[in-house]
């Protein structure tokens, strides 16, 4: 602390004020009768240098001028830009055991002249809002920096208002508090921004605009839309702007979409009809304005509407397939299966579908409604069969789709020939075959079908289809295939009035097997051994397996074990094998191969054959 | 009751300096706009300079830019006019007033728009 400087003085030339690079030179001067007591001679100036309130250099050797114990003068340079603060002390140097004692301080600030204002923008928000102007100061001066905006216009009228940058604000903004309304749409006015500080001053250019170059209207508000007649795509879009708007831009999309639909408006007057909207889709409006064809700016974004368009009768056709089952010798069981519309079909929310079968001669018709993607009925198995299925929302139903119910694997001639699945990757299945050999009939289109291979797949799970024109030899299938599963896939020929198919096992990807096969029984039957086994849980088998191996070998033998290749077959759970010797015990067990290798063994039995063998 | 008192008229030579003062009783004028007129003998009365409280901003007519200074102490709801290198021309009676909101370009500088009026205060520039 300096005790408000009752010992002496301290003076700065040229002023507390340089430029960066100048020096300085700091004189400290004690009062009269100020001092040593006892020896003014002994009375020795010290200047002291404190940055930031530390202390960073003792000034001692910087003396240019000594009035022994009455004044000194410091030669102070190299001065960093800000503030830097010197202290002057008295040492009395006959007692040691004192410290200094301050004399008195000054502050030296080291700065540069303010460089011109530069890039000036001037804004109005609103025909209410009031003029705001921004410029671009330079380079920081380290000194109080005073700035004053002027705007001069019309009626002989200038606008000032001032505010100063320092080491805690930055003045580069200032908002006069004025209002330009729309009366001076023709009149221009003048901005410049002068900067003054200690070691100067600087003006920018000035800048000229016009009420149309700085007013940028508020967004509009109050955003509406009006369905004509409830339609789903067309609508009239309403908003709110202020009077002196004629251009708009409007905006739209729906939700999940990244691109906007732009449209310009000239002279809306606040309303606007679309023709283009998709029905029952959740879509984001948003609109512009601008006060000006040609100049101007235009307004930020209205906050969006949010609104979903309403229902229109759907379109498109539904996908359909179907599975027979015979029950006895007069009767079938149908199932009717069908894909859902996609949202751009669908033109709603689908409420339920119509179902109809109905045998061709129109003896009978069968007639329902559901909300579920498939249906099933019993029918007598005489008679030709014909379903259709339309699906509806709350303004209408889609054309119904038909089919024609044939044998689907009936006619062999329409069978597919070599027929191949390939896993592409982790979920997809490449599916290729060549078309029926000798078809007396054309084939009208493909099916390609898949399921699971899983217990009770064809009760509880729907199929899966795709539909590939006639002259398509390939399927690339992906929905709902996971990793090391396999599946029954077929693929159909049909015709007009007729159904071949073949079929094939895939998967996407394969592991060997967790477990081999449980051996459950070996019996003996005429000097043969039936071997019977239960097949490796759903989950273990890791893709499609392709053999079962059994094996045997003499108990205790240390001999390589024998072994016999079976190809995989589902309905297949026994075997027989005959070149075993009768009265020698035996350990067999079995193992599974998928096309990534063999499981581990499973189960090991013994047997010991009791009859003739050959 | 709003009341606007000048003060501070005089007569002063060409080249010299007064200080107008303008007291305001009665209500708050943050939000307004208070300026002032002067009327010289046979002449229409003209804006001479005005403060925005809220906004800080001064405005001048292009005559007196440069010359006189506007400013005001809201503790004291006092605006004061700093008149100097006085002309001849500048002989008039000044007005102190005060406008309510908006604030437009438009208005600051006519009469119409000043609801509140002083009675008014003589300065004479002699050569």
């Known amino acids: 602390n300096i005790d408000v400087c009752k010992l002496g003085t301290v003076t700065v030339q040229p002023a507390p004020v340089i430029p960066l690079g100048s020096a300085a030179n700091i004189s400290c001067s004690l009062n009269p009768k100020q001092g040593c007591s006892h020896y003014p001679s002994s009375n020795e100036l010290i200047l002291l240098k404190f940055v930031n309130d530390v202390l960073v250099e003792n000034l001692h050797g910087k003396k240019v001028h000594d009035h022994t114990g009455h004044s000194s003068t410091f030669q102070v340079t190299n001065l960093s830009l800000g503030m830097t603060l010197f202290v002057c002390k008295l040492n009395c140097s006959n007692s040691q055991k004192k410290p200094p004692v301050p004399v008195c301080g000054v502050e030296i600030s080291v700065g540069v002249a303010p460089e011109p204002p530069q890039n000036i923008s001037c804004v109005q928000e609103g025909e209410n809002g009031t003029v705001a102007c921004s410029w671009n100061s330079g380079k920081v001066t380290y000194l109080k920096t005073n700035y004053t905006l002027q705007l001069s216009g019309p009626n002989n009228l200038t606008c000032q208002k001032q505010c100063f940058s320092d080491n805690r604000q930055n003045c580069n903004r200032l908002d006069l508090g004025i209002n330009l309304s729309p009366d001076l749409a023709e009149s221009r006015f003048i901005v410049r921004v002068t900067a003054i500080n200690d070691l100067g001053n600087s003006s920018s250019l000035p800048h000229t605009f016009t009420f149309l170059d700085i007013v940028i209207p508020l967004p509009p508000w109050d955003i509406r839309i009006n369905f004509l007649n409830a339609s789903g795509s067309r609508g009239t879009l309403q908003w709110e702007d202020e009077g002196q708007v004629v251009l708009n831009q409007l905006r739209y999309q729906p939700l999940n979409s990244t691109s906007w639909n732009m449209v310009n408006a000239t002279n809306a007057k606040g309303k606007y009809d679309l023709r283009d909207l998709r029905p029952f889709t959740e879509y984001e409006f948003q609109i512009s304005s601008k006060l000006h064809l040609s100049g101007g700016s235009w307004s930020n974004w209205s906050e969006s509407l949010r609104t979903r368009t309403p229902e229109e009768e759907p379109v498109g056709i539904l996908d359909i397939w179907y599975m027979k089952q015979d029950i006895d010798y007069d009767r079938q069981q149908i199932s009717l299966f069908w894909k859902s519309l996609n949202p751009s079909e669908a033109r709603g929310k689908i409420l339920h579908y119509q179902v109809t079968l109905q045998e061709v001669t129109k003896k009978t018709t069968l007639q329902n409604t559901t909300r579920h993607t498939s249906w099933t009925r019993v029918i007598p198995r005489t008679g030709a069969w014909t379903a259709s299925v339309s699906a509806a929302n709350s303004k209408g139903a889609s054309a119904p789709t038909h089919i024609n119910i044939v044998d689907l694997c009936g006619t062999g001639l329409l069978a597919p020939h070599q027929v191949s699945a390939k896993s592409e990757n982790m979920d997809n299945i490449l599916v290729t075959w060549q078309p029926p050999k000798k078809a007396d009939s054309a084939v009208r289109e493909y099916i390609v079908e898949w399921r699971a291979l899983q217990p009770g797949s064809i009760t509880k799970f729907p199929p899966h289809w795709l539909r590939i024109p006639p002259d398509n030899m390939s399927a690339l299938i992906s929905e709902n295939i996971k990793p090391y599963i396999c599946y029954e896939i077929r693929v159909h020929a049909l015709s007009e009035s007729q159904g071949g198919c073949s079929s094939i096992r895939g998967d996407s990807k394969h592991k060997a097997p967790v477990s081999g096969p449980h051996i459950t029984a070996i019996t003996e039957k005429k000097e043969r051994l039936f071997i019977s086994w239960t097949h490796i849980p759903f989950p273990e088998q890791r893709g499609c397996i392709l053999h079962y191996r059994i094996y045997w070998k003499e108990r205790d033998s240390t001999a390589q074990p024998e072994l016999c290749e079976i190809q995989y077959r589902r309905s297949q759970n026994s075997h027989p094998i005959s070149s075993l010797q009768p009265r020698v015990t035996y350990v067999l067990w079995m193992t599974a191969v998928t096309a990534a290798g063999e499981s581990p063994q499973g189960n090991e039995r013994e047997f010991c054959p009791q009859g003739k063998a050959n | 009751q709003v009341q606007l008192q000048e003060s501070g008229g005089g007569l002063v030579q060409t080249g010299g300096s007064l200080r107008l003062s303008c007291a305001a009783s009665?209500?708050?004028?943050?939000?307004?706009?208070m300026g002032w007129f002067r009327q010289a003998p046979g002449k229409e009365r003209e804006f001479v300079a005005a403060?925005?409280?809220?906004?800080?901003?001064?405005f001048y007519t292009d005559s007196v830019k440069g010359r006189f200074s506007i400013s005001g102490d809201g503790a004291k709801n006092t605006v004061y006019l700093q008149m100097n290198s006085l002309k001849a021309e500048d002989t008039a009676v000044y007005y102190c007033?005060?406008?309510?909101?908006?604030?437009?370009?438009?208005?600051?500088?006519?009469?119409?728009?000043?609801?509140?009026w002083g009675q008014g205060t003589q300065v004479t520039v002699s050569s």
């Open positions: 009665g209500r708050t004028f943050s939000n307004s706009v």
């Open positions: 007033a005060a406008k309510n909101p908006p604030h437009r370009w438009s208005d600051i500088g006519k009469s119409p728009h000043y609801e509140y």
């Open positions: 403060l925005m409280w809220s906004a800080g901003s001064e």
